[in-house]
């Protein structure tokens, strides 16, 4: 009896399993039981990353400057272009179709993770004994200073957006 | 035991016709692809045409398209090559072969074709 | 058409000796290639397939090799039976095509 299914690398047609094309190469005609399929390479600009039985090759994706995208790894015949965003940017999406200016830690805030070219950066209250009074891409919380090691006493509790103001010890007590 | 026997070969005037025959026996005829395969004398081999398994497509050479007609009835075991506007070229021992995996693993003993006026 | 070309076209050697043929194709054909044997008066007989599988109840001594446009069919250690005409056919691209021969004979 024809087959009804086919082993991997192979797909059904006319009642016959036929070899699909290797990544990097697209069908140009289907086999028959005297010739084995017929593939071509994809073009320059083009891939396929599957085995496959794709007529056409996809184009590889467009890194468009204008909107702050650059190549961050040039695609082949079985991969596609790999885009990233110019320093200072990050991704929209997971397919990094277009970017946004990396966000920034309002003061009270730290960096917590410093962004890429495909994440924001991830930003985290200051917790009691540090503190931010910057709006900033790149700095964490700073820890207060320490009035004491200085041999000097607190005139200003410190917050999150502020450090401690340290001053001389009152002789009278 | 798998045997192929052509035939219904002879002398033919150009612009005949011919009909040759391959009766198959020894294995599952109608799973099988067969093709006819030529040879002119001293010559070289030359695909001519193929037929698929289970009533399958056509395919033919070139330089035979338009004038031969593969066929195969399953139910007498027997493939055929109806040959028409035969010329001075086809003259041949003509085989028939059991196709399998992209390969003629049986043929025939040939049969011979020789078109003369 | 693809076109196979063979070579070389005739060939004289020894028994016992070492041979190899070439077949070269007008493209790549990947490795879709059969080598047949054929003795004068005899029908064509499948030696390799798929360009270096040994068809079943063929000798060892015959091997197969190759892939894209270059291939080779090579007799280890001739044996008297082996003098006969030699041919590879692609089956990459309909039609299947042949290569023109070779003829093996006894020096």
């Known amino acids: 009896e024809p087959p009804t299914a086919c082993r991997e690398k192979q797909y059904l047609i006319n009642s016959q399993c036929c070899s699909l094309c290797q990544p990097g190469q697209k069908l140009v005609s289907d086999c028959t039981e005297f010739t084995e399929t017929e593939c071509l390479p994809c073009g320059e600009s083009e891939f396929l990353d599957t085995w496959n039985r794709e007529t056409h090759c996809h184009q590889h994706k467009y890194c468009d400057p204008n909107l702050g995208l650059r190549v961050q790894q040039k695609g082949t015949s079985e991969t596609d272009t790999i885009c990233t965003c110019e320093e200072g940017w990050h991704c929209t999406s997971e397919a990094c179709e277009s970017c946004v200016l990396h966000r920034s830690c309002s003061p009270g805030f730290g960096v917590k993770q410093i962004a890429t070219g495909v994440s924001d950066t991830i930003c985290e209250p200051c917790p009691v004994g540090f503190f931010s009074n910057v709006s900033s891409a790149f700095e964490k919380c700073h820890p207060w200073t320490s009035c004491e090691d200085k041999n000097l006493e607190v005139l200003q509790k410190g917050t999150s957006q502020t450090n401690v103001i340290c001053g001389p010890q009152d002789r009278l007590r | 035991e798998v045997q192929l026997l052509e035939s219904g070969g002879g002398l033919v005037q150009p612009g005949g016709s011919l009909r040759l025959s391959c009766a198959a026996s020894?294995?599952?005829?109608?799973?099988?692809?067969m093709s006819w395969v030529r040879q002119a004398p001293g010559k070289g081999l030359e695909w001519v045409s193929g037929?698929?398994?289970?009533?399958?497509?056509?395919y033919y050479a070139d330089s035979v398209k338009g004038r031969f007609t593969i066929s195969r009835d399953n139910s007498k075991n027997t493939l055929y090559l109806q040959m028409n506007s035969l010329r001075a070229e086809d003259t041949a021992v003509y085989y028939c072969?059991?196709?399998?995996?992209?390969?003629?693993?049986?043929w025939g003993q040939g049969t011979l074709v020789t078109v003369s006026s | 058409d693809i076109q196979m070309t063979q070579s070389p076209s005739s060939l004289s050697a020894s028994v016992g000796d070492r041979v190899t043929i070439t077949c070269r194709a007008s493209?790549?054909?990947?490795?879709?290639l059969n080598w047949y044997q054929q003795k004068p008066g005899k029908a064509p007989k499948l030696l390799i397939y798929?360009?270096?599988s040994l068809q079943s109840g063929v000798p060892s001594r015959f091997s197969g090799s190759g892939s894209g446009t270059d291939f080779t069919l090579t007799i280890s250690s001739l044996q008297p039976e082996d003098f006969a005409t030699y041919y590879c056919?692609?089956?990459?691209?309909?039609?299947?095509?042949f290569g023109q021969g070779t003829k093996l004979e006894i020096k």
């Open positions: 037929i698929g398994s289970y009533g399958g497509g056509t």
């Open positions: 056919q692609q089956y990459g691209r309909n039609p299947p095509t």
């Open positions: 798929a360009a270096s």
């Open positions: 020894g294995f599952t005829f109608s799973s099988y692809a």
């Open positions: 072969a059991r196709y399998v995996n992209f390969g003629m693993d049986y």
């Open positions: 493209q790549s054909i990947s490795s879709y």
